[in-house]
Interface confidence: medium
């Protein structure tokens, strides 16, 4: 008999369902906008916007202060009075659209759908370890705005983006607005514009930079900014658009728009179409040859990775890389394939793509056909040829034109297609330790702490745990607060520890010891915790093996049994060499010889799967009682491993010991050339892992085994004569004495 | 029993480079972390950094980063040290050490080797 | 980088007294500290990890406590083989770092 110990799915180790509580805050309404902010004299403060109102929070989640930011023309509406009396527009509710922080005075910003989409900016001053907001200012001058020319109407009802950066003693605000037709014809926000702020907060400095969908493209090609981000010398936009100026707005895909951080200039505004794709290992028939694309960006996160993934990508240690979530559609509807897929684009890398594309259409030779591209914002032209021109002029540089790069940078899904199921709402990448940890939001509330690597087969979780009760998706925007992130989700905000929320998730010990050292998960005699929850009984040292199984369940009282146990933590080396005197089995009174592995019956455990065997002969003492009885594993001495060494005693019930007897043999006689079927009759004739008839001391080969019957074929005899016919189990012989008579053929 | 055996004393010539072994045996080398730690004369203890020979993966300290290569050769068992650009400030014994489980612990150590770097 | 503070530098001590050693950590590392002996000429010898766990084969007189920032190890009663060198060593981060040691002799 070969029995294997049956495999014990690695998702075993684990119970996602395992409720736990982090702090949160009721915003009183759908969260617009959160954003934090952590000064040097340790205070800080959580700004969380809702519609006609900002909360500022303490880094409790308890309320500091509110501020009424609408409706328009409301006479309790804080903000508004700012801009001295009005009516400065038509009435209606505020829905935030921009929260961001001016980290150089420092200050809150916010703007709005109402008021032309107008900004204020709130002086933040620290209280202790809190923050409270100055009484706004209003960043708008009616003498400088008018409906075509409107350096202070920043945000777009459908959407906008900003990002602050300093350049010298000024802020300048990198804003992106999604537009259409409406939006375009009241107050003219533009598509991509670098506002400076003027230095006695009135507003934005005139005169600014720009880049606006054409008129003709705004109802058929409408860009939607997704993130945006600043790193290095340069801002980055994501954007969501439709493929093509001219072909089926429907068909869309992802960029990247890439702006110069150090000069307020839209000259050197670049643009690349980065390609998200599912390569599954194993290519389904009629599968694209490059992998299923995922042209759409859900949501967006850069950060320094730590080694592993470095590693993986190909770039050292602590270096930029963004990523994204994409989904096959704007609907994100399950196609073939995962309904997310995370793809990972290394800074450097599409710095040198964006460089290497300008080189393309602006150095000999020229490649004829080459288009600049950004239709959508500019007159279509060849390269080397501004928007617009047949030719360079001798005092214009091709390089000081916006262009779109002419190839796309591809990567594909690092989960490998894992993430299955799972709508991915939000996204955000820290570096723990060595550890790259994507946290994601879900569409159906849950927090997946997860770790970002390449090589495996299976997701390596810190965690994966519902916010709340509510179910409600997580929303795009997350914030990061000492070591916490903050997530939204309907009208809460949540805190959740960058750490993972707690270790109850992990329901062995050695799947607890493995965790992640920042996870700070020891064992607490029967659970996985924290050491705040079970200071008596908490260690990160040891863990005790775990029988689950074992085989058979029953030995003859006379006689060995091989016996094989199943669990885990017996060795914790694959070879299965088990160090001299470490382990001790005993069953009943009666030890249990430990055997070296069979080498020939190692089989490779694919990771996904855990369990471990360990062999044992069992010679039952003189004094061993027939009946049920305990299996018992004691494992001292072993060595540490990598993560814990292995200490203690695992008891197993659900063993017998049992006497075989043999009740009768027929027939009793048979041809001296053998194949007489005999049938041996009696009780407990199958317990243990050996048997065997003997007839005249040769084997008769065995056909079948059950408790009260064994039948076996006779081998040819000698001559014709009466023979012994004796059964052993377990090596000993049953009692009773039996002959066979073989006769003439 | 556990036993790190490492390579003998070396004299070298500022500038030069010394490589140090460390021949582990009575365990499974790729069950734990091997670190490396250096002690000038009269001085106290200067952690280097250390390998995981199961994976290569290797951490060090950014005083010694970019002159240290810590290397494990798991068909021998032996894990090495090897120090670059060598000055007079590196004269010291160097000792390798068995990293304990994941604690960051050192439970067994090598007998030391010593290094003089001179002119 | 986290900075392990050990004091005294040396202390001397009679055969049968508590001796106390403290390290200071310069940044919260929880129970992540081990404490070392070494005779001279000779490796160091593991004797406390993880703050308070007694190593394999250490004889009961030694102990550790402590956690965050703050940890004392103690010989309950000095014995003349205890002369040596005591090092603590903090495992929360790389790169890992050791105290100064301190120096024990006997009165």
């Known amino acids: 008999e070969d029995w294997q110990c049956p495999r014990t799915p690695y998702a075993a180790s684990r119970d996602f369902d395992v409720k736990y509580v982090v702090p949160s805050f009721s915003a009183g309404g759908l969260v617009q906008a959160m954003v934090t902010y952590e000064g040097d004299r340790n205070e800080s403060a959580v700004f969380v916007a809702i519609r006609n109102r900002l909360h500022v929070l303490g880094p409790d989640l308890k309320s500091v202060q509110s501020l009424a930011t609408g409706p328009a023309g409301d006479p309790g509406c804080q903000t508004c009075a700012a801009c001295g009396p009005g009516p400065h527009g038509p009435p209606g509710d505020t829905d935030t659209k921009v929260l961001v922080l001016d980290p150089a005075l420092p200050a809150l910003v916010s703007c709005g759908s109402s008021l032309q989409g107008r900004c204020f900016l709130h002086d933040l001053e620290p209280q202790g370890t809190a923050v409270h907001l100055a009484a706004p200012a209003c960043l708008f001058s009616a003498h400088h705005n008018r409906p075509d020319d409107c350096p202070d109407c920043v945000a777009s009802p459908l959407g906008t983006r900003v990002t602050v950066v300093e350049q010298g003693q000024a802020s300048y605000f990198y804003v992106a607005s999604s537009l259409d037709a409406a939006v375009a014809a009241s107050f003219s926000p533009r598509s991509v514009s670098i506002r400076r702020l003027k230095a006695d907060a009135s507003g934005f400095a005139p005169g600014f930079v720009a880049l606006s969908v054409l008129p003709k493209h705004l109802v058929s090609y409408s860009i939607e900014y997704v993130h945006s981000f600043h790193t290095g010398a340069f801002v980055y936009f994501l954007t969501v658009q439709p493929a093509s100026v001219t072909d089926d707005p429907s068909a869309l895909h992802t960029r990247l728009a890439r702006l110069s951080a150090t000069e307020p200039e839209l000259g050197d505004y670049r643009e690349l179409v980065l390609d998200c794709r599912f390569a599954p290992k194993r290519r389904r028939r009629g599968a694209p040859e490059g992998g299923q694309p995922y042209p759409v960006l859900r949501v967006a996160h850069s950060a320094p990775v730590g080694a592993q993934l470095a590693t993986e990508l190909s770039i050292a240690e602590g270096q930029e890389v963004l990523f994204g979530v994409f989904v096959t559609g704007k609907d994100g509807g399950p196609g073939v394939g995962p309904n997310s897929v995370v793809c990972a684009f290394p800074i450097d890398l599409l710095d040198t793509l964006i460089d290497e594309g300008v080189e393309r259409c602006c150095e000999s030779p020229v490649h004829p056909g080459l288009r600049r591209g950004l239709d959508f914002f500019q007159s279509p032209s060849f390269c080397p040829n501004p928007p617009g021109l047949e030719a360079l002029s001798p005092n214009t540089s091709c390089r000081h034109f916006p262009l779109l790069v002419s190839s796309s940078f591809s990567r594909v899904d690092l989960f490998n297609g894992l993430l299955g199921p799972v709508q991915v709402t939000a996204l955000y990448v820290t570096r723990l330790d060595n550890v790259t940890v994507a946290h994601m939001g879900t569409m159906d509330g849950r927090i997946l702490q997860v770790e970002l690597v390449r090589s495996l087969n299976y997701l390596l979780y810190v965690s994966n745990f519902s916010l709340g009760d509510s179910g409600q998706p997580v929303q795009r925007d997350v914030s990061r607060l000492g070591d916490h992130l903050l997530f939204a989700s309907g009208d809460q905000v949540f805190q959740v520890p960058i750490q993972g929320p707690g270790c109850r998730h992990f329901l062995t010990c050695g799947r607890c010891l493995r965790a992640w050292h920042f996870m700070g998960c020891g064992w607490c005699g029967n659970m996985c915790g924290q050491q705040k929850e079970c200071p008596g009984s908490w260690q990160q040292d040891h863990c005790p093996p775990k029988l689950t199984e074992f085989h058979p369940h029953s030995g003859p009282l006379r006689g060995s049994t091989r016996l094989t146990l199943c669990g885990s933590n017996f060795y914790l080396h694959p070879s299965g060499l088990v160090p001299e005197g470490t382990h001790q089995v005993t069953v009943g009174q009666s030890p249990c010889r430990p055997l070296p592995k069979d080498s020939s019956k190692l089989r490779p455990v694919p990771r996904k799967d855990f369990v471990e065997e360990f062999e044992c002969e069992l010679e039952p003492l003189g004094t061993q009682a027939v009946g049920p009885t305990n299996v018992s594993l004691t494992v001292t001495n072993m060595p540490p491993g990598k993560h814990f060494r292995v200490d203690g005693t695992s008891v197993l019930r659900g063993f017998s010991f049992m006497e075989p007897v043999l009740i009768a043999v027929q027939p009793l006689f048979g041809p001296r050339a053998g194949g007489t079927c005999l049938t041996l009759e009696g009780q407990s004739l199958s317990v243990g892992t050996s048997r065997a008839v003997l007839v005249n001391g040769t084997e008769c080969l065995l056909a079948r085994v059950s408790e009260g019957q064994l039948l076996c074929a006779t081998p040819p005899g000698a001559t014709v004569a009466s023979v012994p016919l004796s059964l052993q189990v377990g090596g000993a012989q049953v009692p009773g004495s039996w002959t066979f008579q073989y006769r003439e053929d | 029993q556990v036993q790190l055996v490492q390579s003998g004393a070396e004299v070298k010539k500022p500038g030069a480079t010394v490589k140090i072994s460390c021949k582990v045996s009575?365990?499974?080398?790729?069950?734990?972390?091997i670190h490396w730690v250096q002690q000038a004369p009269g001085k106290g203890l200067e952690w280097m950094g250390r390998?995981?020979?199961?994976?290569?993966?290797?951490k060090s300290d950014p005083k010694f980063q970019v002159r240290v290569t810590i290397t494990a050769d798991t068909s021998t068992d032996t894990a090495y040290m090897e120090l670059s650009s060598l000055r007079s400030e590196d004269t010291a014994v160097y000792y390798c050490?068995?990293?304990?489980?994941?604690?960051?612990?050192?439970?067994?150590w090598g007998q030391g080797t010593l290094v003089t770097v001179s002119r | 980088d986290i900075q392990m503070t050990q004091s005294p530098s040396s202390l001397s001590a009679s055969v049968g007294d508590r001796v106390t050693i403290t390290c200071h950590a310069s940044?919260?590392?929880?129970?992540?500290l081990n404490w070392y002996q070494q005779k001279p000429g000779k490796a160091p010898k593991l004797l406390i990890y993880?703050?308070?766990n007694l190593h394999t084969g250490v004889p009961s007189r030694f102990s550790g406590s402590g956690s965050g920032t703050d940890f004392t190890f103690t010989i309950s009663s000095l014995q003349p083989e205890d002369i040596a060198t005591y090092y603590c060593?903090?495992?929360?981060?790389?790169?890992?770092?050791f105290g100064g040691g301190t120096k024990l002799e006997i009165k």
């Open positions: 060593q903090q495992g929360q981060s790389y790169p890992l770092t």
């Open positions: 940044q919260n590392i929880n129970v992540w």
């Open positions: 390998i995981d020979p199961a994976d290569g993966n290797r």
């Open positions: 993880k703050a308070s």
């Open positions: 009575g365990y499974t080398f790729t069950d734990t972390y």
């Open positions: 050490a068995r990293g304990y489980g994941n604690l960051n612990a050192m439970d067994s």
